[in-house]
């Protein structure tokens, strides 16, 4: 058998079984399930004198492990004293020790656990005509218990003859039922099940809570998108309230301006979510000039489920400004997907973080659903960056092999936009001078930024591929490098994926 450390258990008598005039008393410590021999048992008796006796180890027949008992007999004022049994098993490890501290005798009762359960609402979340509360008094040493129901702290006149007691092994359980009319339950009173046992009081309380406990309602207020602000010139802000429990009470959203000037008419939309919660949005058109000049807009939210009114405010972001740098590139052909390509656009070092990203093909803006753009993330410096990804089809690039990634940002000049063109096959197409790049080279991340994509499929570059500085004829930002394949007999610019 392999080495096994012991399990240690205190051995005590019940207090009620020890005569009150006893001058000495014996307690013990069981070490069991250990292998191999021996264990060393020592006792800390505090200020008292005691004699110890460790019985010879016995073998546990099924496992072949050992068990032993050490007994301590103490005399004097043992009732108030705590004793520590210390078991050491050096075969487990030189410092393996288990301490158990306990008194001479165990409490002579196990106190009950009191818990109130309530009957369910119906499927629609409504309360039935009567509500049952069930008080479960469980896990106590059999004995007399007294159950009292309280309503807002006052004793209720309840027929307790329905209380039933059951015994499971050494412990007993009792349950008492209270039936309430819907009117009483909805009146928001607190109901308490109070249990008196062995001179102690135990209780649990409950009350109607569905209307009052919010699930964690959140309110958010967005700033206008740069696209709406600078291109469409019809900016809007949206107040979003989420995680509302559906109820008769309606959400009240009130718009105001810090300047006290009147606000435009807002539009409101309510939507029930799959998880049963309600989402409310209110959209307010704002003046382009008002916004740019720094007006603060406020959305005040009240609802029966909210402990207090919530206010959200928004205004133009303050602080330094920096225009975005835009870099667009295409992934080379991947085996098995000849008729599709992914275009990527890195937009970085802009401040503040508000940015709109668009893709254009044939001078037409592609729907937002076509591309996926990350949320702005902070660079190691003070700016922000985003990635945008667009999947294009062979039909599109054969029609015209030029796609434009455009960033709309307040610091971009002259017209709040910066764009880069990218081609799927740059050698074949008359690609824009804005986006020169060597054929089939790939941008690599040199560790200066977080959040850049890894190689396709999560792979890492080929062992012979290293991230080296891009050539001088390829204009790229300093934190992006070119991945060079050094394998013999292959073209010097072979794509292995993003680093």
């Amino acid at each position: 058998a392999s080495t096994q450390s012991p399990s240690v258990f205190p051995l005590t008598r019940c207090c009620k079984n020890i005569p009150s005039n006893a001058t000495s008393v014996t307690l013990g410590c069981l070490a069991t399930g250990y292998f191999p021999e021996p264990v060393m048992v020592t006792w800390d008796t505090g200020s008292l004198n005691g004699t110890t006796m460790t019985l010879p180890a016995t073998t546990l027949t099924l496992s072949g492990h050992y068990a032993t008992i050490s007994l301590l007999t103490v005399s004097g004022a043992w009732a108030k004293q705590m004793f520590t049994c210390r078991v050491a098993h050096t075969p487990s490890s030189t410092d393996w020790v288990d301490n158990k501290t306990f008194s001479v005798c165990s409490r002579d009762f196990t106190p009950p656990t009191v818990k109130i359960l309530q009957s369910s609402c119906d499927g629609g979340g409504h309360f039935p005509p009567t509500i049952q509360l069930l008080c479960l008094v469980s896990g106590y040493t059999p004995g007399t218990i007294n159950i009292t129901w309280l309503e807002d702290g006052q004793v209720m006149d309840v027929d307790l003859s329905t209380a039933s007691t059951t015994q499971e092994g050494e412990l007993a359980s009792t349950q008492s039922e209270l039936t309430l009319s819907q009117k009483h339950w909805l009146s928001d009173r607190t109901y308490t099940c109070q249990v008196t046992y062995q001179g102690h009081t135990f209780e649990d309380s409950t009350k109607k809570c569905a209307d009052s406990n919010p699930r964690g309602v959140s309110a958010y207020l967005s700033r206008p998108s740069p696209f709406d602000l600078f291109i469409r010139k019809s900016p809007t802000i949206t107040c979003l309230v989420v995680d509302l429990a559906p109820s008769k009470g309606t959400v009240n959203l009130t718009w105001s301006r810090a300047s006290g000037k009147p606000v435009n008419h807002s539009t409101r939309k309510e939507e029930k979510q799959r998880n049963g919660t309600l989402t409310v949005t209110s959209t307010l058109p704002v003046g382009t000039r008002d916004w740019i000049e720094g007006e603060t807009y406020q959305c005040r939210v009240t609802h029966p489920h909210l402990p207090r009114a919530l206010m959200r405010s928004t205004t133009k972001t303050s602080g330094p400004r920096a225009a975005p740098e835009v870099y667009a590139f295409a992934t080379p052909e991947w085996p098995g997907s000849r008729d599709k390509r992914t275009l990527a656009c890195l937009i970085q070092n802009f401040m503040p973080e508000d940015i709109s990203v668009q893709w254009l093909h044939n001078e037409v803006q592609l729907p937002d659903a076509r591309h996926s753009t990350t949320q702005p993330r902070k660079t190691k410096g003070s700016g922000f960056f985003v990635f945008s990804r667009l999947e294009v089809t062979r039909a599109e690039w054969e029609q015209k092999d030029e796609f434009i990634c455009r960033a709309v940002h307040e610091a971009a000049s002259p017209s709040q936009t910066v764009q880069r063109a990218v081609s799927v096959n740059p050698g074949l197409a008359g690609g824009s001078a804005q986006s020169q790049r060597a054929p089939d080279r790939v941008l690599c991340h040199s560790g200066q930024q977080q959040g850049l994509p890894r190689a396709a499929g999560g792979s890492v570059p080929h062992p012979r591929c290293h991230c080296g500085a891009g050539r001088a004829d390829w204009p790229g930002p300093p934190e992006l490098d070119v991945c060079v394949e050094e394998a013999e007999g292959e073209a010097p610019w072979t794509w292995t994926g993003l680093c």
Epitope: D188, P214, S218, S256, Q298, T302, R308, A309, L310, M311
Partner: antibody
Framework: QVQLVESGGGLVQPGGSLRLSCAAS????????MTWVRQAPGKGLEYVSI???????WYANWASGRFTISRDNSKNTVYLQIDRLRAEDTATYYC?????????????WGQGTLVTVSS | DIQMTQSPSSVSASVGDRVTITCQAS??????LAWYQQKPGQPPKLLIY???TLASGVPSRFSGSGSGTEYALTISSLQPEDFATYYC????????????FGGGTKVEIK
């Protein structure tokens, strides 16, 4: 001007009950969420309960079951009922007004009423 | 529940000193952090709301800053009447919190 005046405090035995009142003046009570905050002698501020403008209420976990907040806008009064009082409930109880526009804390406090629980 | 942890619990400073008290929330607060000043025998007084907005009648030497989970109250030049206890409060409890106040910071005369 805005005024909140608490009353109903005093010496009470453990297990007893008290009803604290808060008389509001100088503003429209129905427009404001109202809060009770307590402060044990020499200790920090402790939130007890809030009642919103709709009359719905919330309690600190430890207060649920023994504390009941209510309001009567027609009488410009907010109440706090405390049942089965314990020694640890000894504190100054403040009635406080939440700002109207929300999310901004308490802009007016009463002077407080002292509740002493002792046998 | 969002817990508010205030530090230090006390600070000794002299008139004219710059004093900063910090408050850490166990979760991000979207808006609504308030600061209060309390003098012995008086109720608290609102100093700052919405993280950084000065309440009416509060001197400009008081300022509030921070976002997310970290907040600070700064007194740029301590005046004799500023010796008091200061509390932060998470005042935006749509997420119902058990105690919305920090433990307090006592600013004492050095």
């Amino acid at each position: 001007q805005v005024q909140l005046v608490e009353s109903g405090g005093g010496l009470v035995q453990p297990g007893g009950s008290l009803r604290l009142s808060c008389a509001a003046s100088g503003f429209t009570l129905s427009n404001h969420d109202m809060t009770w905050v307590r402060q044990a002698p020499g200790k920090g501020l402790e939130y007890v309960s809030i009642i919103n403008t709709y009359g719905n209420h919330w309690y600190a976990n430890w207060a649920s079951g023994r504390f009941t907040i209510s309001r009567d806008n027609s009488k410009n009064t907010v109440y706090l009922q405390i049942d089965r009082l314990r020694a640890e409930d000894t504190a100054t109880y403040y009635c406080a007004r939440e700002t109207h526009h929300g999310s901004s804390g308490i802009d007016h406090w009463g002077q407080g009423t002292l509740v002493t629980v002792s046998s | 529940d969002i817990q508010m942890t205030q530090s230090p619990s006390s600070v000794s400073a002299s008139v004219g000193d710059r004093v900063t008290i910090t408050c850490q929330a166990s979760e991000s607060i979207y808006s609504g952090l308030a600061w209060y000043q309390q003098k012995p025998g008086q109720p608290p007084k609102l100093l700052i709301y919405d993280h950084s907005t000065l309440a009416s009648g509060v001197p400009s030497r008081f300022s509030g800053s921070g976002s997310g989970t970290e907040y600070a109250l700064t007194i740029s030049s301590l005046q004799p009447e500023d010796f008091a206890t200061y509390y932060c409060q998470h005042a935006d409890y749509a997420h119902h919190s058990d105690n919305v106040f920090g433990g307090g910071t006592k600013v004492e005369i050095k």
